[in-house]
Interface confidence: medium
């Protein structure tokens, strides 16, 4: 039938070591209130509960002050197991990584997860990526029809571990030049050799017709 | 948002049973203790079921073998399965976040801090 | 079982006042006590816990004293909308207990 507390003639147990730093104890219970700047932790062991005077909260708790008592408070901080206080976690439940009193599954953008420790340090910060450049190809920017164009951004700030790999920091892409031939009429040898194989395979193929019409035509009087 | 809605009460026959729930939305439910707390119309508060976070229950003597409460941490889902009902549990049925006698104090473990819109529940033939 | 006893079943007030309800537990409860007000056709809400811890968004208007078996909501200045009825609960030991409520009505 609940907990019915069997009170004690006596203020405090002194003797009793679950009486140490309450202001008022029970045998059955344990303190009801405790010093000055010490933490009172109610322990509930199923229906029965005692509580105790800390100097400090246990893991999983954080000391809260209060005006007419100091107590340990559960870390309501999702995937937490310790913390300093309502809000901000010191220690993550494994798997997780400590990112600013917070408990995250992997850590967000612009922070690495630094496992020997299970925390988000600061990664490698880059800048913005410049504009596209110039399409070109051999250093040329013309007598090709594909090129390159690349685009580069630059390292803000170092990772703080070497460890830690920095994004890419240059980056290119096939592009269409503007001047397929340069101007001045010059023309690359490879361009030059590119458009006499083009010129002698169009006469092979009109050649090819020719003759399949000629073979038609002379079946056809047979 | 913490939002709680109940759903399922209604009216039932002395020694029959009935089963409600309530849908929670806008916190990490399986990370918190959940309760039913019940309103006689009287307007007197009863305190009627926990279920901690690890999914240990408890209960008042006055419900204790005829009420059982569960949850489903997938669908974010409280239940109440009430029998051998009388009429003195003819009461609005309100489900609450926290109240978990199972863990140690805390900040809202032990008092309800978020409470739905109810469910009536009459007992009567 | 611990006992909460609200002595007042009502009180009357006027908006400006300041206005104390009261809640004896029968057994000292370690300041594990809260207050809940519930407004006319509304579910109860969590005002103040672990004795003087006031709750997310509750105005601090409202304030708890009190310590062993003996505690007090106080609203230091009443307003229109604080009309509703206020409840005790002891958090320390299970089962947990309600006071009877208190209904604070405006003049």
């Known amino acids: 039938q609940g907990n019915r507390w069997r009170r004690s003639k006596r203020a405090s147990y002194v003797s009793n070591p679950i009486c140490k730093g309450c202001l008022s104890c029970s045998k059955d219970n344990g303190c009801s209130r405790c010093q000055q700047k010490l933490f009172f932790f109610l322990r509930r062991e199923g229906m029965r509960q005692y509580g105790e005077c800390l100097h400090s909260c246990p893991s999983g708790y954080y000391g809260h002050r209060a005006p007419d008592m100091n107590r340990c408070a559960r870390c309501r901080i999702e995937n937490c197991d310790s913390c300093f206080s309502k809000d901000f976690c010191t220690k993550c439940k494994v798997g997780f990584y400590l990112h600013r009193g917070r408990c995250f599954d992997e850590c967000p953008d612009g922070f690495a997860p630094l496992e020997e420790t299970m925390e988000c340090v600061e990664g490698c910060e880059v800048g913005h990526w410049s504009e596209w450049g110039t399409c070109s190809r051999n250093n040329r920017t013309c007598g090709f029809k594909w090129g390159l164009e690349t685009r580069t951004r630059q390292i803000v700030k170092k990772p703080v571990k070497d460890t830690i790999l920095c994004p890419t920091i240059a980056e290119s892409r096939r592009c269409k030049m503007t001047m397929r031939h340069c101007p001045g009429g010059k023309r690359t040898p490879k361009a030059k050799e590119k458009r006499n194989k083009k010129k002698k395979r169009k006469l092979i193929e009109r050649a090819q017709e020719q003759h399949s019409v000629f073979l038609a035509t002379d079946r056809a009087n047979q | 948002e913490v939002k709680l809605v109940e759903s399922g009460g209604g009216l039932v026959k002395p020694g029959g049973s009935l089963k409600f729930s309530c849908a929670a939305s806008g916190f990490s439910f399986s990370s918190y203790a959940m309760s039913w707390v019940r309103q006689t119309p009287e307007k007197r508060l009863e305190w009627v079921a926990s279920?901690?976070?690890?999914?240990?229950?408890y209960y008042p003597d006055s419900v204790k073998g005829r009420f059982t409460i569960s949850r489903d941490n997938v669908r974010n889902i409280l239940y109440l399965q009430m029998s051998s009902l009388r009429s003195e549990d003819t009461a609005m049925y309100f489900c609450?976040?926290?109240?978990?006698?199972?863990?140690?104090?805390?900040?809202?473990?032990?008092?309800?801090?978020?409470w739905g819109q109810g469910t009536s529940v009459t007992v009567s033939s | 079982d611990i006992v909460m006893t609200q002595s007042h079943k009502f009180m009357s007030t006027s908006v400006g006042d300041r206005v104390s309800i009261t809640c004896k537990a029968s057994q000292d409860v370690s300041s594990a006590v809260a207050w809940y007000q519930q407004k006319p056709g509304q579910s109860p809400k969590l005002l103040i816990y672990?004795?003087?811890t006031r709750h997310t968004g509750v105005p601090d208007r409202f304030t708890n004293s009190g310590s062993g078996t003996d505690y007090t909501l106080t609203i230091s200045s009443v307003q229109a909308e604080d009309l509703a009825l206020y409840y005790c609960?002891?958090?320390?030991?299970?089962?947990?207990?309600f006071g009877g409520g208190t209904k604070l009505e405006i003049k």
């Open positions: 279920i901690s976070s690890g999914g240990s229950t």
């Open positions: 609450a976040r926290g109240g978990d006698p199972g863990v140690y104090n805390g900040d809202y473990e032990d008092a309800m801090d978020y």
């Open positions: 609960q002891q958090h320390y030991s299970t089962p947990w207990t």
């Open positions: 672990w004795a003087s």
